[in-house]
C-alpha cells in the first residue's frame, strides 16, 4: 500500500511535471515567428486512454519527437532549453510510471498538434494531482 | 523553517537594469519552482514568470518576455530576477514565491528620473 | 490569458459578521484556484489551495468553494486581523492570473 511520503513524492513529481508542460505550452502561445506555423504542422500521437501513471509510457514515446520540435523554436525568446526540459521530464515520467511492468502504449486513431498534445497531458497530471490533493 | 530573503531596496533610472535576489532556506531547494511576482503601488498581484531550480530553464509573461531573466545558483539556493529597460511603470514590490504559498518579504524597486 | 473577475471590489463588515467574495474565472479552471489574503506592506498569506483545501496553519473560519468558472471564499465571522485585501488566483495554465483584489474594511 502506498505510504503518505510516497504519495507526497508522486504528487510533487506530477506536479514538476505539470509545470515543464505548462512552462513549454506558454513559450509556444508566446510564440511570436513564422516557425511556429511550421511547428503546428507536426503530429503527435495521443493515447487512446491516459488515467494512470503507467499509461506515461505514451508521453515517454513521444519525448523524442517533442525535442525536435522544440528544437525549431530556439530564440531569444525562447527560454526553454529543449534537451535540458526533455531530459528533466523523461527522468520524472519514468520515476511516476515506474519500470517493473512493461505497458504497451495504445494511441488514439487521430494525431495531434504540439498545442493539443500538452493540453492532453497537461490535463492528465491535473487530473491525477487533483485526485491525490 | 521554510524561508525566502530578497536582496534590499533598489532605486534605478529609466533605462537601467535591476536584479532582485531571492534566498530559499529550510526546504530541498530543487523540490519547488519559483515564481516571481510584482506589484505596483497600490495595484493587484501580476505573474512575471517561473524558474525550474534544479535544470534552471524559464517561463515568461509575454508583457515580460524580451525584458526579464530569471536564473538560479544551486550552490547557494538562491535565485536571482534581472529586469532591464526599466521605466517608472516597473515601480513595484517584487516577490518571489515558491510553489505560491510562501513567499518573499518583498523587493521595492524604485525607477526614478 | 484567463481573466479572473473578483466581486466586491470594496466591502465594509463588522467583527463577527459573514463575509463571502466571489471569483469568476473566464473559462474553466476545475479547482485550480487559490485565496490569498494581504495586509499592506506584507506579501501575501496562502488562505485557501484546491479551491477548497484550506492551508495549514490558517484558521477554520476561512473557506472556500466552487469548481469550474465560479467561486467563493467564506470568513464565517470576521475578526479583527481578517481586515486585509483578498485575492483569488488561478494555475490552471500559463501565465498565472489574479483578481484585481477585494479589500475588506472595517464598518
Known amino acids: 500500500a502506498p505510504t503518505s511520503s510516497s504519495t507526497k513524492k508522486t504528487q510533487l513529481q506530477l506536479e514538476h511535471l505539470l509545470l515543464d508542460l505548462q512552462m513549454i505550452l506558454n513559450g509556444i502561445n508566446n510564440y511570436k515567428n513564422p516557425k511556429l506555423t511550421r511547428m503546428l504542422t507536426f503530429k503527435f500521437y495521443m493515447p487512446k486512454k491516459a488515467t494512470e501513471l503507467k499509461h506515461l509510457q505514451c508521453l515517454e514515446e513521444e519525448l523524442k519527437p517533442l525535442e525536435e520540435v522544440l528544437n525549431l523554436a530556439q530564440s531569444k525568446n525562447f527560454h526553454l532549453r529543449p534537451r535540458d526540459l526533455i531530459s528533466n521530464i523523461n527522468v520524472i515520467v519514468l520515476e511516476l510510471k515506474g519500470s517493473e511492468t512493461t505497458f504497451m502504449c495504445e494511441y488514439a486513431d487521430e494525431t495531434a498538434t504540439i498545442v493539443e498534445f500538452l493540453n492532453r497531458w497537461i490535463t492528465f497530471c491535473q487530473s491525477i494531482i487533483s485526485t491525490l490533493t | 523553517q521554510v524561508q525566502l530573503v530578497q536582496s534590499g531596496a533598489e532605486v534605478k533610472k529609466p533605462g537601467a537594469s535591476v536584479k532582485v535576489s531571492c534566498k530559499a532556506s529550510g526546504y530541498t531547494f530543487t523540490d519547488y519552482y519559483m515564481h516571481w511576482v510584482r506589484q505596483a503601488p497600490g495595484q493587484g498581484l501580476e505573474w512575471m514568470g517561473i524558474i525550474n531550480p534544479r535544470a534552471g530553464y524559464t517561463s515568461y509573461a509575454l508583457k515580460f518576455q524580451g525584458r526579464v531573466t530569471m536564473t538560479r545558483d544551486t550552490s547557494t539556493s538562491t535565485v536571482y530576477m534581472e529586469l532591464s529597460s526599466l521605466r517608472s511603470e516597473d515601480t513595484a514590490v517584487y516577490y518571489c514565491t515558491s510553489g505560491m504559498d510562501v513567499w518573499g518579504q518583498g523587493t521595492l524597486v524604485t525607477v526614478s528620473s | 490569458d484567463i481573466q479572473m473577475t473578483q466581486s466586491p471590489s470594496s466591502l465594509s463588515a463588522s467583527v463577527g459578521d459573514r463575509v463571502t467574495i466571489t471569483c469568476r474565472a473566464s473559462?474553466?479552471?476545475?479547482?485550480?484556484l487559490a485565496w490569498y489574503q494581504q495586509k499592506p506592506g506584507k506579501a501575501p498569506k496562502l488562505l485557501i489551495y484546491?479551491?477548497?483545501s484550506l492551508q495549514s496553519g490558517v484558521p477554520s473560519r476561512f473557506s472556500g468553494s466552487g469548481s469550474g468558472t465560479d467561486f467563493t471564499l467564506t470568513i464565517s465571522s470576521l475578526q479583527p486581523e481578517d481586515f486585509a485585501t483578498y485575492y483569488c488566483q488561478q494555475s490552471y495554465s500559463f501565465p498565472v492570473t489574479f483578481g484585481q483584489g477585494t479589500k475588506v474594511e472595517i464598518k
Open positions: 484546491a479551491a477548497s
Open positions: 473559462q474553466s479552471i476545475s479547482t485550480w
